[in-house]
């Protein structure tokens, strides 16, 4: 057991150009937290992965306010260590993510929010028990610097803090075998009671009652050395003497997965298959419950009353992720129908919609026509959010109020002259041309292509449109 | 600023189920979660449920088995239904509009009464 | 479910003095999610604070609210008559949402 220990030493802009804007403004005050989050070994998993080593999350640093004009400086940070202790040993490597918190402070939606501000994440061999070790690391345009360290809890002590500690027995020295607990010389290495029998050269053990086998090494008592002559089977019958695998207990023997977890033998060693809630080597580490405020923004933790029964979180509007974290741009998600423009205005959400529709999100479409005439005569029709009149002859616009100039539109084909008249449009065709619009040639020979033409009028003559 | 008025029955039998209406004076209802909560004469208040217009909800797990939360946009109302009702459930109901920073409860209705009797 | 308590149970005072309500939760109200209403007779509650410590719109700055984990604390100023009414916390850190019994607040 131990603690791994993380200082932060400062936050802010990195060099070169292209300085961050501060986090925090007059009308916007700030407060930066951090969150660390440890995994074991050279993971390289998503920020989302559980925290199988453990999580920690730092108070709230000092409140801040830009100084108008003034770059963004190293930012205030909140007193103390992180601490993220481990229960079993330490692995020696592992990966953490560091993620720099902002709690904004103004009022403008009633209360505090908070954003993640950079996130920062790597892998690294570590000693416990050795000194700080210093880091920085960018990401974007700020750069945090921090060190870390991990260290056991006594009794634990050495790199993995595995070794047990115990008061010397004697005032001088150590019992028969036994070495001093460096760095606490007043103390002396106390023997873990292995397994009975557990070879002392070739064995070790990391729990008490249990016999592991270094390398090239097998059996119970790990007394047999691992030949690579041939055997009936890879753990088939044998002897000591043959120097094959006997059929001793396999790593998954008395179930090394705590917390109901399934064992699987792999190559090396072991893998767990861990029940919902808990994590790590054995399944010993515990996920996150609704006890440890996951929810951020005013999120609501439901379930998760049990390290066994995962957590979600209810995000009030406006926020969204596994914890509320992130910000959402509603607009984005084009709630507005019928062409109604979006306002997110933080604590709500509202639509303006266009002339002929309603609701929340303009999905209800109005009776166009209610209550709406045209004039001169004019037919409402009802379509796309407004109404529409459809005017009688001689009349336009949108209500049918203006008189219409029939001969705007170049209705006589073939250069036919246009003429307005009190009901309609005449027109007068060119040579060679007849009909309403002008449309039909006149055949050579004087015959049209249409019926012969009405008593009084000439081809050519101007043809009345009625 | 928006109003909230509770409706329904004022009495209700015995193993009979309670219904009631609450009507939101605006078009907000889509922006907000909406809640429900009772409180019995001279007691304290209890949350029931709430409600979101995407479909999620929550409920009270002692009630939850007896209740149903649901909501209309098209009319701006939710609602609530308490099945089986006993002499116990008789309390003032509120529906209220859920705080759009975190689940306290910014704006009330009145309150109906509801008596259980047969 | 987080049990409040709230204490006294209730708190004879004279206008103008200072009242001093509490709410203890059975486990820790995470990120200082909580609540506080007034209640007048024969009325709907009032929202006066919310994250423990934030005074809700057009709520008198008479009305204080502090504390943090389980401890929290509802601090009326300088009480004016029309503060003599029951007040109630509540949690919303984790659900269910509960609320604490009340704390009646009358003239002595």
């Known amino acids: 057991a131990g603690v791994f220990e993380l200082q932060i030493h400062s936050f802010g802009p990195g060099p070169g150009p292209g300085a961050p804007r501060s986090p925090c403004s007059a009308r916007l005050p700030c407060r930066l937290f951090f969150r660390v989050c440890l995994k074991p070994g050279l993971s390289e998993e998503a920020a989302e992965s559980p925290c199988a080593l453990g999580a920690a999350l730092s108070a709230r640093g000092p409140v801040y306010t830009e100084q108008p004009g003034a770059p963004a400086p190293d930012l205030p940070l909140p007193d103390g260590l992180l601490q993220v202790p481990f229960r079993d040993a330490w692995p020696g490597t592992f990966s953490f993510i560091i993620e720099t918190w902002r709690e904004e402070l103004g009022d403008q939606i009633g209360g505090p929010a908070w954003s993640l501000l950079a996130r920062v994440a790597g892998r690294r061999r570590l000693a416990a028990g050795g000194p700080w070790a210093r880091d920085i690391q960018r990401a974007g345009a700020w750069e945090l610097r921090f060190s870390y360290r991990a260290r056991c809890e006594p009794p634990a002590v050495g790199t993995a803090c595995t070794r047990l500690c115990r008061p010397r027995s004697a005032p001088s020295r150590c019992g028969p075998g036994l070495r001093p607990c460096a760095p606490l010389e007043d103390e002396c290495e106390a023997p873990l009671v292995c397994r009975a029998g557990c070879s002392p050269e070739h064995g070790f053990c990391e729990q008490p009652g249990e016999c592991r086998c270094l390398e090239g090494w097998t059996g119970p008592l790990c007394t047999v050395p691992v030949s690579t002559s041939s055997c009936l089977s890879p753990r088939g019958p044998s002897s000591a003497t043959t120097g094959c695998l006997v059929p001793g207990p396999g790593p998954c023997d008395g179930n090394p997965c705590a917390n109901g977890g399934s064992c699987s033998e792999t190559p090396r060693s072991f893998e767990c298959t861990c029940p919902r809630g808990f994590y790590g080597l054995r399944c010993e580490v515990s996920g996150v419950t609704c006890a440890d405020g996951p929810c951020f923004n005013g999120g609501l933790c439901v379930g998760g009353a049990d390290p066994d029964s995962a957590y979600i979180c209810h995000c009030p509007p406006g926020f969204q992720g596994s914890n509320c974290e992130k910000r959402v741009d509603r607009c984005s998600l084009q709630p507005c129908r019928n062409g109604g423009l979006c306002l997110d205005l933080g604590h709500a959400l509202r639509c303006r919609c266009r002339a002929g529709f309603a609701g929340p999100r303009c999905e209800h479409d109005l009776d166009d026509c209610a209550g709406r005439a045209c004039a001169n005569g004019g037919t409402c029709v009802e379509g796309g959010g407004a109404h529409r009149c459809s005017c009688a002859l001689g009349f336009g616009g949108r209500d049918c109020r203006e008189r219409a100039d029939p001969c705007a539109a170049r209705p006589c084909a073939h250069g036919g002259r246009c003429y307005a008249h009190f009901s309609g449009l005449v027109c007068a065709c060119a040579p060679g041309y007849m009909g309403a619009r002008c449309e039909f040639p006149v055949h050579p020979d004087g015959a049209s292509a249409l019926p012969a033409a009405p008593p009084g009028l000439r081809p050519g003559d101007p043809q009345r449109y009625l | 600023q928006v109003q909230l008025q509770e409706s329904g029955p004022g009495l209700v039998k015995p193993s009979e189920t309670l219904s009631l209406t609450c009507t939101v004076s605006?078009?907000?209802?889509?922006?907000?979660?909406w809640s429900w909560i009772r409180q019995p004469p001279g007691k304290g208040l209890e949350w029931i449920a709430y409600?979101?217009?995407?479909?999620?909800?929550n409920y009270n797990p002692s009630l939850k088995s007896r209740v149903t939360i649901s909501l209309d946009t098209s009319k701006n109302q939710f609602s609530l239904q308490l099945s089986s009702v006993t002499a116990a459930d008789a309390a003032v109901y509120y529906c209220?509009?859920?705080?759009?920073?975190?689940?306290?409860?910014?704006?009330w209705g009145q309150g109906t009464m509801v008596t259980v009797s047969s | 479910e987080i049990v409040l308590t709230q204490s006294p149970g209730t708190l004879s005072l004279s206008p103008g003095e200072r009242a001093t309500l509490s709410c203890r939760a059975s486990?820790?109200?995470?990120?200082?999610?909580l609540a506080w209403y007034q209640q007048n007779p024969g009325q709907a509650p009032r929202l006066l604070i919310y994250?423990?410590?934030s005074r809700a719109t057009g709520i008198p700055d008479r009305f204080s609210g502090s504390g943090s984990g389980t401890d929290f604390t509802l601090t009326i100023s300088r009480l004016e008559p029309e503060d003599f009414a029951v007040y109630y916390c509540?949690?919303?850190?984790?659900?269910?949402?509960?609320f604490g019994g009340g704390t009646k607040v009358e003239i002595k």
């Open positions: 209220a509009r859920v705080f759009h920073w975190g689940f306290a409860f910014d704006i």
């Open positions: 605006d078009n907000s209802i889509s922006n907000y979660y």
């Open positions: 409600i979101y217009y995407s479909g999620t909800t």
């Open positions: 486990q820790r109200v995470s990120n200082t999610y």
């Open positions: 994250g423990a410590s």
């Open positions: 509540q949690q919303y850190g984790t659900s269910p949402l509960t």
